[in-house]
Interface confidence: low
């Protein structure tokens, strides 16, 4: 005997005994393959959850996470809290870099900014939450402009010059 | 249009029983059929249907216990074993609709009464 | 499986008033809900189809409404014909319920 629900395409389902008819699969429903027995309950995006594209009555609605989240697993099947730059992953959840460090990656920790002093270089650009200090130059020994001598530094290298 | 059923009698449990439905003023091939029953004092209750095209469905507490078929102009309901539970009055019933999904009885008969006793 | 439970199982109205009766689906029926008055030793008599359309040649004081798994048929102006079973029908499935009929509501009109 010929299956009647082979008749029934995408969008409906093979719901009524009655002259082979089909019926369309109800409101927050789908079904994605011709011949369905029944419609399949349309996933609801809550939560950490969002809709990227609305259920129709040939596709289930396809969800996304919410600012801070990341998808993980086929579908997005879940949501994983996914901080910005400046911010930290804690058991508490994401938490914004504490004054003198920064996270400059959309992972990972905090990281102290770089201490410019201890390479002898002045700072150039101030550190923020989100990028790390930005050292100048190792200074010379003098200001541009201040009168001076150049004399050679015994043992020097050639071209190393010391202000007197 | 009309919908007659008869065959109904009384029977001893385990002898097979077969009620008829014939039907005038339309025809078997535009109609789905349904057979209802009715326990004394009770409420309604489906057994299966015969769609246009001769494929039958039936209640799941049904399956096995009865056979529905059909000719031309007429439905036909085998009670396969019947027990003291399945004396009711049989109705048999015509599926009408619209719109693919829309669907509802439109034409019942009168019934017939199936006493199943010892 | 689709279940329908009807309420009340019983219900006594004075002539001229009002009688609702409650049929709820265990899932959506999408508005493929039906209504049956049926009287002693008669046949059930299609009164609504499609949970709100009236069939033909039923009183326009008999109103079906409601969508999803909640239906309702009100009888406005009670009159003493309308003493009877009242029963809903849900649309019907391939994999189909055990009864596709409500468990019926006897009207009782004084």
């Known amino acids: 005997v010929p299956d009647p629900c082979s008749n029934c395409s995408a969008g409906t389902f093979c719901g009524k005994n009655i002259q082979e008819l089909c019926m369309p699969c109800p409101s927050n429903s789908f079904s994605s393959t011709s011949g369905q027995k029944a419609c399949n309950v349309c996933r609801k995006c809550e939560g950490v959850f969002r809709t990227k594209k609305e259920c129709s009555s040939t596709s289930n609605a396809v969800c996304e996470c919410v600012p801070g989240f990341r998808c993980l697993g086929a579908g997005c099947a879940m949501c994983e809290e996914y901080c910005q730059q400046g911010q930290e992953l804690t058991q508490e959840g994401c938490k914004d870099c504490s004054f003198g460090t920064f996270n400059d990656e959309e992972h990972g920790v905090c990281r102290p900014w770089t201490d410019c002093s201890l390479a002898g270089k002045p700072v150039l650009m101030n550190g923020t939450k989100a990028r790390d200090v930005v050292c100048g130059p190792r200074p010379t020994d003098f200001s541009p402009g201040t009168p001076s001598t150049t004399m050679p530094v015994p043992g020097g290298e050639p071209g190393h010059t010391s202000h007197v | 249009q009309s919908v007659e059923e008869s065959g109904g009698r009384l029977v001893t449990p385990g002898t097979p029983l077969t009620l008829t439905c014939t039907v005038s003023g339309f025809s078997l091939s535009s109609y789905a059929m349904s057979w209802v029953r009715q326990a004394p004092g009770k409420g309604l209750e489906w057994i299966g249907i015969?769609?246009?095209?001769?494929i039958t469905y039936y209640a799941s507490w049904a399956k096995g216990r009865f056979t529905i078929s059909k000719t031309s102009t007429m439905v036909d309901l085998k009670i396969t074993s019947p027990t003291t539970e399945d004396t009711a009055t049989y109705f048999c019933a015509r599926l009408n609709g619209f719109d693919d999904y829309v669907r509802y009885f439109d034409f019942w008969g009168l019934g017939t009464l199936v006493t199943v006793s010892s | 499986a689709i279940e329908l439970t009807q309420t009340p199982s019983s219900v006594s109205a004075a002539v001229g008033g009002t009688v609702t009766i409650n049929c709820q689906a265990s899932e959506s029926i999408a508005s493929n809900l039906a209504w049956y008055q049926q009287k002693p030793g008669q046949p059930p008599k299609l009164l609504i189809y499609?949970?709100?359309y009236l069939a033909s040649g039923v009183p326009s004081r008999f109103k079906g409404s409601g969508s999803g798994t909640e239906y309702t048929l009100t009888i406005s102006g009670v009159q003493s014909a309308d003493a009877a079973t009242y029963y809903c029908?849900?649309?019907?499935?391939?994999?189909?319920?055990?009864?596709?009929f409500g468990g019926g509501t006897e009207v009782v009109v004084k």
């Open positions: 015969i769609s246009t095209s001769g």
């Open positions: 499609a949970a709100s």
């Open positions: 029908q849900s649309a019907f499935y391939v994999s189909s319920s055990d009864n596709a």
